[in-house]
Amino acid sequence: DTYKSEIAHRFKDLGEQYFKGLVLIAFSQHLQQCPYEEHVKLVREVTEFAKTCVADESAENCDKSIHTLFGDKLCAIPSLREHYGDLADCCEKEEPERNECFLQHKNDNPDIPKLKPDPVALCADFQEDEQKFWGKYLYEIARRHPYFYAPELLYYAIIYKDVFSECCQAADKAACLLPKIEHLREKVLTSAAKQRLKCASIQKFGERAFKAWSLARLSQRFPKADFTEISKIVTDLAKVHKECCHGDLLECADDRADLAKYICENQDTISTKLKECCDKPLLEKSHCIAEAKRDELPADLNPLEHDFVEDKEVCKNYKEAKHVFLGTFLYEYSRRHPDYSVSLLLRIAKIYEATLEDCCAKEDPPACYATVFDKFQPLVDEPKNLIKQNCELFEKLGEYGFQNALIVRYTKKVPQVSTPTLVEVARKLGLVGSRCCKRPEEERLSCAEDYLSLVLNRLCVLHEKTPVSEKVTKCCTESLVNRRPCFSALTPDETYKPKEFVEGTFTFHADLCTLPEDEKQIKKQTALVELLKHKPHATEEQLRTVLGNFAAFVQKCCAAPDHEACFAVEGPKFVIEIRGILA
């Protein structure tokens, strides 16, 4: 459909509330340091302009693309260069280069303090102005996560508001709010990581990589839907995510709503698990579909070998309709294996493709590819064994101990990576234990590998900004589906020149005593990384001793009447002790 005014079209489709929310998200994701009030002003101006276009689509500037309108707004900010430096250089470019330039300036690791929930203050804000409260939530999440899936953020904002509606009435606001906010925070962080991986796959590996990922995932979830149906959804979904990852948030939200409508209208041919999703309002409906439980497998699935090994036309299909044929293979294999991770399914499809590429050029192709399915077993065994070993280690060490083991493992593999990144990534990798190891056997593999893909993507995104390790670059860029096996296969870096011992790194202060437990852990784990960068060959025993001594030293000083005085006296002794242990 063609519309005279794109902005009027989106305003009418989305309605004022969602339109304003999405515009706020868009600006917050680009200008991550601007105060909330400045964004509100921009949103107000864009909304007023959109309303004039709704009233008269021929009005001045209403025919301009949304990129042009948004870009002009950003470039009109007087303090742009002062606050954002070379982002202002984008304004010298023409569309579409200007928008591409803005996208490249999004910061995945902005220097914004962590949000600390204060129940009393938050309830006061909530009760004073619900609309502002909703907007502030969108702003705070969007600026910290510049690739957050915008329509999904609108959904989380509704949930957030609901939590406050309930808890601000409670006698003990904190007891009601804090666990609910923490639970929501975890969901939001997972959602951010999932979307960041989707955007990375589209931007770094192309739309086909994303479509393959989606085809496998949807085939697992909707095994009753036929290939053509799944392919249609995959195509539409790719468009939605391409738009959101590209900053076209209004179009993305609009198209996502259309896709949810289509899925619900055709749920009979897609899945039996969508009924209750489709009765919900739009944002809840889309979220519910995305999280829908796996449908049961059809009872009459025939052996895959019939279609992909035994048939005489395998090479004809491969040569004449390669992408479609490999797509049907991935679809058929995935729907039969809900227990496999998406990455594993894609690795299997790659092996199938490589085998046909080789065999179809030979004298006797059927004899050559007859055993292709046997090649898949090692691919399945590798992650299964790895997960088994790591879950055993997790059971033995507990979450904190398991994180520390991963800190040691990864710092030895890639010691060049910055300490905050190593701590963040290893801590997140360590959470795979509590997330997945308790799951039933048939869920462990997909849970663990799909989660690890999210965490390793975070490492890749951070490393790309300031590349320091060729090994990391190689694992991140060579193959999306082999990232995890690539990192798993890395061995300690023997070429690394140890860091000088810097005493300041191991200087601690009284503030350590009042830190929440997780922040205390981060301090200790930061010291552990620094220790390993200084002594990469430190033994497990030495590290255990140092960590034990550190815990004792902190406990002693936090129990002392004058914390700071104790740290000043005991700190240097602790440093000497460390050097002695590691000598």
């Epitope: 025939n302 309709a321 049907t328």
Partner: nanobody
Framework: EVQLLESGGGLVQPGGSLRLSCAAS????????VAWFRQAPGKEREFVAG????????YYADSVKGRFTISRDNSKNTLYLQMNSLRPEDTAVYYC???????????????????WGQGTLVTVSS
């Protein structure tokens, strides 16, 4: 639900020609591969020819290669089998079959095709 209805069968002399049609209906039928099978008295159903859905690809049994041509007209949702140089051994009931949502013919095993027409009889005799 896919529905298939064959027509165009009849009696023809050896060396003659015949054109079979299969009217197909159902969701995404234009993106579904459709095949022709045949069954001679006392024999198993055998694959004759097939055509991709949304993909330009055709398939033939060795016994009919060069004599039969399969085609489709998506605007009419119709599949055709042009049969030339007919032989007595081509005598059989010809069936149209589909596996919904499958854009390619990935198997000639009749049991894997859930949807069938009622068949049209072709007799080649002098």
């Amino acid at each position: 639900e896919v529905q298939l209805l064959e027509s165009g069968g009849g009696l023809v002399q050896p060396g003659g020609s015949l054109r079979l049609s299969c009217a197909a209906s159902g969701r995404y039928i234009d993106e579904t591969a459709v095949a022709w099978f045949r069954q001679a008295p006392g024999k198993e159903r055998e694959f004759v020819a097939g055509i991709g859905g949304g993909v330009d690809i055709t398939y033939y049994a060795d016994s009919v290669k060069g004599r039969f041509t399969i085609s489709r007209d998506n605007s009419k949702n119709t599949l055709y089998l042009q049969m030339n140089s007919l032989r007595p051994e081509d005598t059989a009931v010809y069936y149209c079959a589909a596996r919904p949502g499958q854009p390619l013919i990935t198997s000639k095993v009749a049991d894997l095709y859930p949807y069938w027409g009622q068949g049209t009889l072709v007799t080649v005799s002098s």
